[in-house]
Interface confidence: medium
């Protein structure tokens, strides 16, 4: 599923050809139906202010690589979503790079700040992973690891709209070291603060840190799953949590290996390999159908690690919702 979005080729990071990331590969978006509402959501996701235009992606150099795929045929946002991933999308079926979508957001001068509050994750793969930097008096500063905690990371991830914080031992690699002044250390967050600037900290600019102590944070969308409608937590219709919304999973390609991963993830033992009839006794779901064509090897620890179509892409009805029965 798309895990990142960026604008490429513009003079600043808030304008350019739209590219999305899927399985580590960046691809473009076809401009079918692409309009100012879609750009508004994209600008919001990137922290680039209001939408100012829907220029063609073809305008921006260098052009998309020939081997680079067009990943999305069309995007349809209402304009209120926080991310493109929350908008209705169609998988690509017929689009060339001459039809790549572009976007332009307002205020390039302040476009290097992903959110108004002035915090960003720099030099990472996308805006939800990277070195923590905070803006103070129009200057970006790095944050020292001394006193940093997962609670502080939670605040940053929430502030950036990037989901939950991931516990990571990753340090800033040499080429990602900061070159800016070191802002502060001894961050003391409870985890409930709205912004990192709300957390108590040591004095501004007064520390003995160096840049190999810069803080690295990684966030990811919350992912969870559950079985509903059964007699216990280990049987029922499968629902997955994505972007804060529960939705069902289509049974196309679903089989024993997929069952096993779900049971394993839930700590529910092994799959009882229910019959088609048994699977149908939990009834159809309502709302979003999040996943389709899920393919697991059986070795995965989480359904999230299995291959599947883009989130929200499917050709299913709720009559095809997957149900799973585990040994408990």
């Amino acid at each position: 599923s798309p895990s990142g979005v960026r604008l490429v080729g513009g003079l600043h990071r808030c304008e350019g050809r739209v590219e999305v990331e899927q399985k580590g590969q960046w691809g473009t978006v076809c401009d079918d139906g692409w309009d100012i509402k879609d750009v508004a959501v994209l600008c919001r996701e990137l922290g680039c202010g209001a939408a100012s235009g829907t220029p063609s992606g073809i305008l921006y150099e260098p052009p998309a690589e020939k081997e680079q795929k067009v990943l999305i045929q069309s995007v349809s946002c209402t304009g209120t979503e926080d991310t493109l991933a929350q908008c209705e999308q169609e998988e690509v079926y017929d689009c060339s790079h001459d039809e790549d979508a572009g976007a332009s957001c307002e205020n390039p001068e302040s476009s290097f700040s992903p959110v108004p509050e002035g915090v960003r994750l720099a030099d990472g793969p996308g805006h939800c992973k990277g070195r923590v930097e905070v803006k103070h008096q129009n200057q970006w500063y790095t944050v020292c690891q001394t006193g940093w905690s997962l609670r502080a990371a939670k605040v940053v991830c929430r502030q950036l709209g990037c989901g939950r914080a991931v516990l990571t031992q990753k340090r800033c690699n040499k080429h990602a070291y900061g070159r800016k002044p070191i802002w502060l250390s001894q961050m003391s967050c409870s985890g409930r603060e709205a912004t990192l600037q709300d957390c108590p900290s040591g004095p501004w600019g007064k520390n003995t840190c160096n840049h190999d102590e810069d803080t690295w944070v990684e966030c990811e969308d919350p992912f969870d799953l559950r079985l509903v409608g059964g007699d216990n937590l280990c049987s029922g219709r499968l629902e997955v949590l994505h972007k804060g919304v529960w939705g069902s999973v289509c049974d196309d390609n679903w089989g024993e290996k997929e069952d096993q991963v779900v049971c394993k993830q839930l700590g529910c033992g092994k799959s009882l390999s229910p019959s088609f009839r048994d699977r149908k006794c939990y009834g159809p779901g309502v709302g979003r159908i999040w996943l389709d064509n899920v393919r697991c090897s059986g070795e995965e620890q989480s359904l999230e690690q299995c291959q599947h179509r883009f989130w929200g892409f499917h050709d299913c009805t709720h009559q095809e919702d997957v149900a799973v029965i585990c040994s408990g």
Epitope: L11, E15, I58, L59, E61, P63, S104, P108
Partner: antibody, heavy 116, light 108 residues
Framework: QSLEESGGRLVTPGGSLTLTCTVS????????MGWVRQAPGKGLEWIGV?????GTVYASWAKGRFTISKTSTTVDLKMTSPTPEDTATYFC?????????????WGQGTLVTISS | ELVLTQTPASVSEPVGGTVTIKCQAS??????LAWYQQKPGQPPKLLIY???TLESGVPSRFSGSGSGTEFTLTISDLECADAATYYC??????????FGGGTEVVVK
């Protein structure tokens, strides 16, 4: 290779007017095309461009007031509710390629006068 | 919106002289700047693009330099035919397409 603008005339404020740029010897699927205007005795003013796939970009002041469209041989500029300040010579221009670029071929321009 | 400020507004130099016109951008535009020459009653003519690349057919007496926010057009060995108004133009991005106010060059 040439560009020729037409449609310029005297229009009353609040009316609507479409200018047409007819291209000769130019494949519009290979070039970004733009419109620029020049009020009498004044400097050049960038209005907007249309990309090879029909996507348009306008100057902030021109959004909602101008619409650029094209066929295989023409590029149109539609003006809605013009005011006397829109009185100018309107030039059609060809970009140097598919991307944002300078304009390396210009039409002679067509004069639009907005007056009651 | 980007603003391009051209100086001077007018300059007068004798035949054989040199004219220097400056163009300052309100934000960095890399090398995405062009220079045009316009004579009365005619459309503009592209002289230089990408800040310093001479358009085909333009005499080498015209040269451009600069990048970022500061750009210069230099006309050396001035000829009578160089009398015209010169404009700079930035041309990259939705909010960065603009023309400078123009510089009138008078050849004495």
């Amino acid at each position: 290779q040439s560009l020729e603008e037409s449609g310029g005339r005297l229009v009353t404020p609040g009316g609507s007017l479409t200018l047409t740029c007819t291209v000769s010897g130019i494949d519009l699927s290979s070039y970004t095309m733009g419109w620029v205007r020049q009020a009498p005795g004044k400097g050049l003013e960038w209005i907007g461009v249309i990309a090879i796939n029909g996507g348009t970009v306008y100057a902030s002041w021109a959004k909602g007031r101008f619409t650029i469209s094209k066929t295989s041989t023409t590029v149109d500029l539609k003006m809605t509710s013009p005011t006397p300040e829109d009185t100018a010579t309107y030039f059609c221009a060809r970009g140097a390629g598919k991307t944002w670029s300078s304009f390396n071929l210009w039409g002679q321009g067509t004069l639009v006068t907005i007056s009651s | 919106e980007l603003v391009l400020t051209q100086t001077p507004a007018s300059v007068s130099e004798p035949v054989g002289g040199t004219v220097t016109i400056k163009c300052q951008a309100s934000q960095s535009i890399g090398s995405n700047l062009a220079w045009y020459q316009q004579k009365p009653g005619q459309p503009p003519k592209l002289l230089i693009y990408r800040a310093s690349t001479l358009e085909s057919g333009v005499p080498s007496r015209f040269s451009g330099s600069g990048s970022g926010t500061e750009f210069t057009l230099t006309i050396s060995d001035l000829e009578c035919a160089d009398a015209a108004t010169y404009y700079c133009q930035s041309y990259y991005g939705s909010s960065t397409n603009a023309f400078g106010g123009g510089t009138e060059v008078v050849v004495k």
